[in-house]
Interface confidence: medium
Amino acid sequence: QESLSCDASGVCDGRSRSFTSIPSGLTAAMKSLDLSFNKITYIGHGDLRACANLQVLILKSSRINTIEGDAFYSLGSLEHLDLSDNHLSSLSSSWFGPLSSLKYLNLMGNPYQTLGVTSLFPNLTNLQTLRIGNVETFSEIRRIDFAGLTSLNELEIKALSLRNYQSQSLKSIRDIHHLTLHLSESAFLLEIFADILSSVRYLELRDTNLARFQFSPLPVDEVSSPMKKLAFRGSVLTDESFNELLKLLRYILELSEVEFDDCTLNGLGDFNPSESDVVSELGKVETVTIRRLHIPQFYLFYDLSTVYSLLEKVKRITVENSKVFLVPCSFSQHLKSLEFLDLSENLMVEEYLKNSACKGAWPSLQTLVLSQNHLRSMQKTGEILLTLKNLTSLDISRNTFHPMPDSCQWPEKMRFLNLSSTGIRVVKTCIPQTLEVLDVSNNNLDSFSLFLPRLQELYISRNKLKTLPDASLFPVLLVMKIRENAVSTFSKDQLGSFPKLETLEAGDNHFVCSCELLSFTMETPALAQILVDWPDSYLCDSPPRLHGHRLQDARPSVLECHQ
């Protein structure tokens, strides 16, 4: 049997050591103990008694099925306890009585059906994070379960087999910053929603089939709900249930952000928000995020004209990796307040982009992200976007562009352009001179000789440059990131010729540790203030005797340098 490894600060690692019991020899010097992925099965009353100063105890996936009632009695300083993914079929309030300092408790993934016959947590007045429940057996949430808890930063409940929710069970917790609920069906959603309206600021619903969700007025008085964010992850919706969900918004008037991740819409986008007051109640929603939305019949999808008015006040929209090939012109024109639009990882091509960015489209748009679509012509893309009079930032990275021409047109206010991972080999005057930030990372550039008088930040890492670009090209440059190129040296003269340079990230290049370079680095301790990741990322590539040495540590041979 292997033993623990502990560092000087009392952090002890005993993960995956095949322990069959809590190891002996634990001491009061231990601050953190991780015994995850073992075969401990049983924790006796004296097993942890020596650990009076323990602050972190992690017992994840250790096959524990029995814990004596007073096993944790000496752990008054414990702040973090993880008992997740064990075999605890029942929970005891006596375990937690002594743990008055506890801030984090994870009981998830154990096969209990309820949280126990009495309240588990009345003494945990400092608790900030609580994770409970499991996939198969946790079936009932009761009013006694959360007694004594008044405020939590995070509460996560995995209740995919929930058979009953006693009304007002969650109401006793007056303030929950982030509540994550794993519910397989929408059956208890209305009750739970009613109980958390006045306490939860961010509600995240996971793995829920909402296809049969039906709204009914909630049995609540007028509440001023603090909820600012609502997220659905791995949920299944239909056109009808989406309409029903919208009706919940009348109870959360301060909602500012809605998110759908990895959801499936079994519908055609035939939304019909029947309640006219829904429109005004969406008034404070500023951010809508949709990632990896799966629409089995996406080829039959509607034009969304029924929700145009819902989105007129939204400022930030992300629809990522969801097979978007067109935002209809009329929809774009309705997005009057939109300042940020991210359509990364979709199917946009120039022909349809032209329709999306029609005259009057996205009149307030400042940032457009079209990363990893199917754009091919930089020239055509710039021309299409001339309609966007307020556009300052454009990300067209991860598109495979044809070689750029000498001349292109771009929106006149554009200051930021991301062309990273676009396969470009040469930069030409197609790139606008108005830019303040340019990202051409991860391309095939072996030189950069474009004059950009306003450029303040240049990102050119992961290319093939052998030297730093000429400083005269960028008179006001503040930041240059040129990692992972083939730069062999830099000198005092080179760096000195960038009059305003504050940050240079040039690590992981192929430095030739010549007498000049090593002398310069030895004589210039101030390099540490300019060079990011100095000294660890700055290694000699040659000569062979210094290969792998840090520039800072490498010493030139007296013979070589004083001939």
Epitope: R163, F188, S216, P219
Partner: nanobody
Framework: EVQLVESGGGLVQAEGSLRLSCVAS????MGWFRQASGKEREFVAA??????????DSADSAKGRFTISRDNAKNTVYLQMTSLKPEDTGVYYC???????????????????WGQGTQVTVSS
């Protein structure tokens, strides 16, 4: 509108038993409440659609003596009362939550539909 019809009340000796029935027009979360003369309506038991039950938390309640059950095929909910005491005397009401609610509740305000009540009198 959900119609609720209670039956089974009556006069019974202390330590005796009674079974109350409530027929509903539909399958809902159902509850039994009671009201003694001059007192507030008090939660007795509740049952959800799948048969999970809920009783009052307090130790001196009827839990252990009273059992709620349902027969969905007959749209009927039962309250089996044993070891009855004089303090169990009162009007027993059957209540139903709206169709879209699935969780049990001990709060009268969460129930939208109510029966007319059936009198239970326990003599000593």
């Amino acid at each position: 509108e959900v119609q609720l019809v209670e039956s089974g009340g009556g006069l019974v000796q202390a330590e005796g038993s009674l079974r109350l029935s409530c027929v509903a027009s539909g399958t809902h979360v159902m509850g039994w409440f009671r009201q003694a003369s001059g007192k507030e309506r008090e939660f007795v038991a509740a049952i959800n659609r799948s048969g999970s039950t809920d009783y009052p938390d307090s130790a001196d309640s009827a839990k252990g003596r009273f059992t709620i059950s349902r027969d969905n095929a007959k749209n009927t909910v039962y309250l089996q009362m044993t070891s009855l005491k004089p303090e169990d005397t009162g009007v027993y009401y059957c209540a139903a939550r709206k169709a879209f609610y699935f969780g049990t509740s001990s709060y009268p305000s969460d129930y939208a539909y109510w029966g007319q009540g059936t009198q239970v009198t326990v003599s000593s």
